[in-house]
């Protein structure tokens, strides 16, 4: 299964970045797994995941950086809580699991560039 | 003459971007000049420019956003003063002027991105 | 960003000359190609002449050698085409323009799409 996202982001100043990862569904899913994956240095980890039913918000784990919605076959991502170590190439992965056949699907990655902010001058 | 720069390169929260252009000299060039343009929008214009003497410090002009130095065959350049808007491809452009013969080489161009940073808050 | 204004075009006899001339902004751009181009009604656009400012090399085709000459007035930022000896072939809208990352110092080798600004153009008509 086909999994598009863009091949570059920037950060905001704030540590947010956000993207749309769009896949080619080829039946009517109704249960959708969405997983963010960073890979830097040969290293892969997970960032976030969320289940969601189809037209239904994306739920990730309270203390997830990552928060989303869902439009059709798009899901809109946003990292927050990024740091100038954080860059690197980060994968979505769609899997529709219900109902059956099982589907699988890997974007090429989205680059994220992070740049830590000046600190702000200490007001006396 | 082949000319090599480095694909990606992210301006500091202050707006300073620095890179390297470096180039396969093919004889002894005792005067080159060094022209930095910018690629956006399929629009190209010239960021800055200077001429230099082997050994010697590159000169840009006082108004110039560019300062840069030379060590050998390469060049060390920095951009300062950029804002997101200046996001976009920059072009090293490198001419050995004298001794004859005359060589021109253009790089591949070095991403430059750059992002606004926030405002601090007001020191009330 | 490069501004271009041709002017000097009109109508000319066969035989006769014109001198076009084209000004430049913030010129001059050193190690680019500055050329003269020109269309002629239901034709492609073509390659007249071109000069590599690195060098001062011209290029001309084959059409125009010998009967045209460009330069350039530094001191004017300007860029000239003396033609001479016009045919009613030469008939066309004359275009000057401004490559500033040749992939060659042969400026008409590689034909026009790189070429990155290009003026309004002026119109030049040959009667025989």
């Known amino acids: 299964m086909h999994v598009a996202q863009p091949a570059v982001v920037l950060a905001s100043s704030r540590g947010i970045a956000s993207f749309v990862c769009e896949y080619a569904s080829p039946g009517k899913a109704t249960e959708v797994r969405v997983t963010v994956l960073r890979q830097a240095d040969s290293q892969v980890t997970e960032v976030c995941a969320a289940t969601y039913m189809m037209g239904n918000e994306l739920t990730f784990l309270d203390d997830s950086i990552c928060t989303g919605t869902s439009s059709g076959n798009q899901v809109n991502l946003t990292i927050q809580g990024l740091r100038a170590m954080d860059t690197g190439l980060y994968i979505c992965k769609v899997e529709l699991m219900y109902p059956p056949p099982y589907y699988l699907g890997i974007g090429n990655g989205t680059q994220i560039y992070v740049i830590d902010p000046e600190p702000c001058p200490d007001s006396d | 003459m082949h000319v090599a720069q480095p694909a990606v390169v992210l301006a500091s929260s202050r707006g300073i971007a620095s890179f390297v252009c470096e180039y396969a000299s093919p004889g002894k060039a005792t005067e080159v000049r060094v022209t930095v343009l910018r690629q956006a929008d399929s629009q190209v214009t010239e960021v800055c420019a200077a001429t230099y003497m082997m050994g010697n410090e590159l000169t840009f002009l006082d108004d110039s956003i560019c300062t840069g130095t030379s060590s050998g065959n390469q060049v060390n350049l920095t951009i300062q003063g950029l804002r997101a808007m200046d996001t976009g491809l920059y072009i090293c452009k490198v001419e050995l002027m004298y001794p004859p013969p005359y060589y021109l080489g253009i790089g591949n161009g070095t991403q430059i991105y750059v992002i606004d940073p926030e405002p601090c808050p007001d020191s009330d | 960003q490069v501004q271009l204004q041709e002017s000097g075009g009109g109508p000319v006899q066969a035989g006769g000359s014109l001198r076009l001339s084209c000004a430049v902004s913030?010129?001059?751009?050193?190690?680019?190609?500055m050329g003269w181009f020109r269309q002629a009604p239901g034709k492609e656009r073509e390659g007249v002449a071109a000069?590599?400012?690195?060098?001062?090399?011209?290029y001309y085709a084959d059409s125009v050698k010998g009967r045209f000459t460009i330069s350039q007035n530094v001191a004017k930022n300007t860029l000239d085409l003396q033609m001479n000896s016009l045919k009613p072939e030469d008939t066309a809208m004359y275009y000057c323009?401004?490559?500033?990352?040749?992939?060659?110092?042969?400026?008409?080798?590689?034909?026009?799409?790189?070429?990155?600004?290009w003026g309004q153009g002026t119109q030049v008509t040959v009667s025989s």
């Open positions: 323009a401004v490559d500033l990352l040749p992939r060659s110092t042969r400026c008409l080798d590689y034909g026009l799409r790189t070429y990155n600004y």
């Open positions: 913030k010129y001059p751009y050193s190690g680019s190609c």
């Open positions: 000069m590599f400012t690195g060098t001062g090399s011209t």
